[in-house]
């Protein structure tokens, strides 16, 4: 089976990853790929190999090891073990199982100080399943009136997905229909003439553009949404840049 | 385990509705879509809509649109289908499906003056 | 709507042999899943996704393709796989399926 991970190379790829420095120059631990390490959600098919890599470096050489749920990860805790590939600053693991599922931290760490970066692994049994969207996306946003602000939705589907962004609206001045439903507002969505549908950009925004915005995902088996609040301040007041929160879970489905 | 139990065969003439079920055990109804599709005779198999239960979102095929209706109660995990102005050429078997691999056993709608 | 047309529409085959079905989409397609159906009843899933065996689905059967051509591949028949086959598309309102190829014994 196909190795999923963060980059579609092999170990014997000929990347730099293990990088030597010189001692008179010593340093904390940092990445040295960070491209490599974006996708942090791996939603992968049962018997399906994982490799997750943390490509770093440093002065001393550091150090990796592997958390699993923020525990010691030990290769008795599943079957068949896992390989380490410390020159690649990776992780494999063979043909997955649901039980594999959860959190992997690989901990970077020298004499003057430690990084850690996690991801989150979700084995997908093998059957259809619902569309899975990365937690903490869209995320919420602010601006002031006239910016211009984007929303992302990160979506995970191995059937064909049908994505809308939407927003609740009133009629009249109710939110909600006589069949207690909401009434909605369907912004963008995907389909021939639509590129992109996983971003929702808003140009120019006014401060009836403020609320709520919903990112719904849909394939034959099932949905998924996520929102996101967009606040709208008054031009002499500057956004205030949101703290960014690691979510846990790292997918919704 | 998975099941979806349909509502038995129905005969019914020109021009009257017919209203089938399907109850849902074994996982989250709410949480997938429910699909109809039929066979006639001999034939093969026609798409006819899908609701999903949490938020009653329905996508119809154009073809069936007016005279199929389909609904669901999710206190009971149970989804229908109901079509009225009903034609010879209705006749099938009925089949209700879900998460894309569980199949109701079918129920035998016959329109017959 | 986007049509698929299976061929063959029947096919007579022996027990050992090797078979393939085709579905070719009118509009190209990211992916393709495959029923059997037996007389009286339901169809029943063999591969989603174009080339990912539903569970408890023999090896022997395969799914592959891409855009308009996609191919249903059961490596050695065996007696229990005479029945109708259809392909199905999940992509784009209204689903439809293919007529059907309908497997005989020769």
């Known amino acids: 089976d196909a190795i999923s991970s963060g980059d579609d190379e092999d170990d014997t790829d000929s990347s730099e990853d293990f990088v030597s420095e010189n001692r008179s120059n010593q340093r904390a631990p940092y990445w040295t790929n960070t491209e490599k390490m974006e996708k942090r959600l791996h939603a992968v098919p049962a018997a399906n190999t994982v490799k997750f890599r943390c490509p770093a470096g440093g002065n001393p050489t550091p150090t990796m090891r592997w958390l699993k749920n923020g525990k010691e990860f030990k290769q008795e805790h599943r079957i068949g073990g896992y390989k380490v590939r410390n020159q690649h600053w990776s992780l494999i693991m063979e043909s997955v199982v649901p039980s594999d599922k959860g959190n992997y931290t690989c901990l970077v760490e020298n004499e003057y100080g430690s990084i850690n970066h996690t991801y989150h692994l979700d084995v997908v049994e093998r059957s259809p399943h619902r569309p899975i969207l990365q937690a903490g996306l869209p995320a919420n946003a602010s601006t002031v009136v006239g910016g211009d602000v984007e929303f992302v939705c990160k979506v995970y589907s191995d059937a064909q997905p049908h994505i809308q962004w939407i927003k609740h609206v009133e009629k009249n001045g109710s939110k909600y229909g006589p069949d207690g439903l909401p009434y909605l507002k369907v912004l963008k969505h995907s389909g021939i003439n639509s590129s992109n549908a996983e971003v929702l950009a808003l140009f120019n925004v006014t401060e009836m553009d403020a609320g709520e915005y919903i990112c719904k995902v849909s394939n034959y088996i099932g949905q998924a949404n996520q929102s996101a609040w967009l606040t709208v301040l008054p031009k002499q007041q500057a956004p205030v840049r949101e703290k960014e929160i690691t979510a846990s879970p790292d997918y919704l489905e | 385990e998975v099941q979806l139990v349909q509502s038995g065969a129905e005969v019914k003439k020109p021009g009257a509705s017919v209203k089938v079920s399907c109850k849902a055990s074994g996982y989250t109804f709410t949480n997938y879509w429910m699909h109809w599709v039929r066979q006639a005779p001999g034939q093969g198999l026609e798409w006819m809509g899908a609701i999903y239960p949490e938020n009653r979102d329905i996508n119809y095929n154009q073809k069936f649109k007016g005279r199929v209706t389909l609904t669901r109660d999710t206190s009971i995990s149970t989804a229908y289908m109901e079509l009225s102005r009903l034609r010879s050429d209705d006749t099938a078997v009925y089949y209700c499906?879900?998460?894309?691999?569980?199949w109701g056993q079918g129920t035998t709608v016959t329109v017959s003056s | 709507a986007i049509q698929l047309t299976q061929s063959p529409s029947s096919l007579s085959a022996s027990v050992g042999d090797r078979v393939t079905i085709t579905c070719s989409a009118s509009?190209?397609?990211?992916?393709m899943s495959w029923y059997q159906q037996k007389p009286g009843k339901a169809p029943k899933l063999l591969i989603y996704d174009t080339s990912n065996l539903a569970s408890g689905v023999p090896s022997r059967f395969s799914g592959s393709g891409s855009g308009t051509d996609f191919t249903l591949t059961i490596s050695s028949l065996q007696p229990e796989d005479f029945a109708t086959y259809y392909c199905q598309q999940w992509s784009s309102y209204p689903y439809t399926f293919g007529q059907g190829t309908k497997l005989e014994i020769k």
């Open positions: 509009s190209g397609l990211s992916y």
């Open positions: 499906t879900s998460r894309g691999d569980y």
